[in-house]
């Protein structure tokens, strides 16, 4: 698995370099996670034909994956920094159970799946430091998450492959929207 941002040897060997600002660190962290998702998607697409499946076939699923909407204030029209930041953090917290589900879904990219999960936890911490209104952030209920995880793991093979594909696709879209929004902050 690639080395997480801020831990490569070049950083250590270049003391003259300016330390990253909070925004730069967040930006770098998101891009690192997106790289990890690309690697995982590659394995998923090689293993099954999910990536070629029609949008209609994939649309019908019981997954309630976080998604950016107009009301979240993350798009250029109606942009609202505080509302958007709360949405990004809340969404990432909601994705955590799905990232946990991904942990046993990869054979050759097992470390990569773990790296995506751990890096997301770090990203959440970075963003929580940036947020002023932490009270507005709702944390998912652990019991609900545990039961959701059990339910997802009980699915047949085809549904598990579809779930894996949908999680990766949605997480990628969510992070891309978050990255665009955070660059406006």
């Amino acid at each position: 698995a690639p080395v997480p941002p801020g831990e490569d040897s070049k950083d250590v060997a270049a003391p003259h370099r300016q330390p990253l600002t909070s925004s730069e660190r967040i930006d770098k962290q998101i891009r690192y996670i997106l790289d990890g998702i690309s690697a995982l998607r590659k394995e998923t697409c090689n293993k099954s034909n999910m990536c070629e499946s029609s949008k209609e076939a994939l649309a019908e699923n019981n997954l309630n994956l976080p998604k950016m909407a107009e009301k979240d204030g993350c798009f250029q029209s109606g942009f609202n920094e505080e509302t958007c930041l709360v949405k990004i953090i809340t969404g990432l917290l909601e994705f955590e159970v799905y990232l946990e589900y991904l942990q046993n879904r990869f054979e050759s990219s097992e470390e990569q799946a773990r790296a995506v999960q751990m890096s997301t936890k770090v990203l959440i911490q970075f963003l929580q430091k940036k947020a002023k209104n932490l009270d507005a952030i709702t944390t998912p209920d652990p019991t609900t998450n545990a039961s959701l995880l059990t339910k997802l793991q009980a699915q047949n093979q085809w549904l598990q492959d579809m779930t894996t594909h949908l999680i990766l696709r949605s997480f990628k879209e969510f992070l891309q929207s978050s990255l665009r929004a955070l660059r406006q902050m």
Epitope: E60, N61, N62, Q155, N156, Q157, L159, Q160
Partner: antibody, heavy 120, light 107 residues
Framework: EVQILETGGGLVKPGGSLRLSCATS????????MNWVRQAPGKGLEWLAQ??????????YYAESLEGRVTVSRDDAKNSVYLQVSSLRAEDTAIYYC???????????WGQGVMVTVSS | DIQMTQSPASLSASLEEIVTITCQAS??????LSWYQQKPGRTPQLLIQ???NLADGVPSRFSGRRFGTQFSLTISTPQVEDTGVYYC?????????FGTGTQLEIK
């Protein structure tokens, strides 16, 4: 050609236990989930247990009605799956089928079944 | 666990009649439902997979449909050899569950 053969049936006393074996050939056993289904005389089909493969951490699932009395296992080297049932009662008398699940979850291949009779 | 309610328990039909058997799932199972035919003393045979796909070698008079959590198996022009017991199976999530079965007699 896919072949599934169940063995280990016969007459068992109430309170006893049994271990059914299911030997398979003609397909890559490691790729598939295997299931056990039973049918009591004159009754309907009852799904009993599922044994997943290595990619799915050898997960096991059981019908609620049998939970605690049944254990499923597999031996990839022997292309075989096993069903252990304990504390047997008269109502466990049935034909026990070993089945191979498809990628989509439905049962695509069935063994011929093995008869288990629980009686004193 | 997901419950499957199958109806009717039995029915008798003539050669010209259209036969429909239904299965109702207690929760959403998507398209993960299959139909089986069993004749006396024989192992069950797969008829329909994933709600509406005909299994290999199954005559086209058999068809499956899905309406949300309700599924139906239709035999458009039943033949005498279609006499037997029909079962649905939900294979969305383990533990899987069969319907109670429908005894069909074609006169």
């Amino acid at each position: 050609e896919v072949q599934i053969l169940e063995t280990g049936g016969g007459l068992v006393k109430p309170g006893g236990s049994l271990r059914l074996s299911c030997a398979t050939s003609g397909f890559n056993f490691n790729d598939y989930f295997m299931n056990w289904v039973r049918q009591a005389p004159g009754k309907g089909l009852e799904w009993l247990a599922q044994m997943r493969n290595k990619n799915y951490q050898y997960g096991t699932y059981y019908a609620e009605s049998l939970e605690g009395r049944v254990t499923v296992s597999r031996d990839d080297a022997k292309n075989s799956v096993y069903l252990q049932v304990s504390s047997l009662r008269a109502e466990d008398t049935a034909i026990y089928y070993c089945t191979r699940e498809s990628y989509y979850g439905f049962t695509s291949y069935w063994g011929q079944g093995v008869m288990v009779t629980v009686s004193s | 666990d997901i419950q499957m309610t199958q109806s009717p328990a039995s029915l008798s039909a003539s050669l010209e009649e259209i036969v429909t058997i239904t299965c109702q799932a207690s929760q959403d199972i998507g398209i993960s439902l299959s139909w089986y035919q069993q004749k006396p003393g024989r192992t069950p045979q797969l008829l329909i997979q994933n709600a509406n796909n005909l299994a290999d070698g199954v005559p086209s008079r058999f068809s499956g449909r899905r309406f949300g959590t309700q599924f139906s198996l239709t035999i458009s022009t039943p033949q005498v050899e279609d006499t037997g017991v029909y079962y649905c199976l939900q294979h969305n999530s383990a533990p899987y569950t069969f319907g109670t079965g429908t005894q069909l007699e074609i006169k």
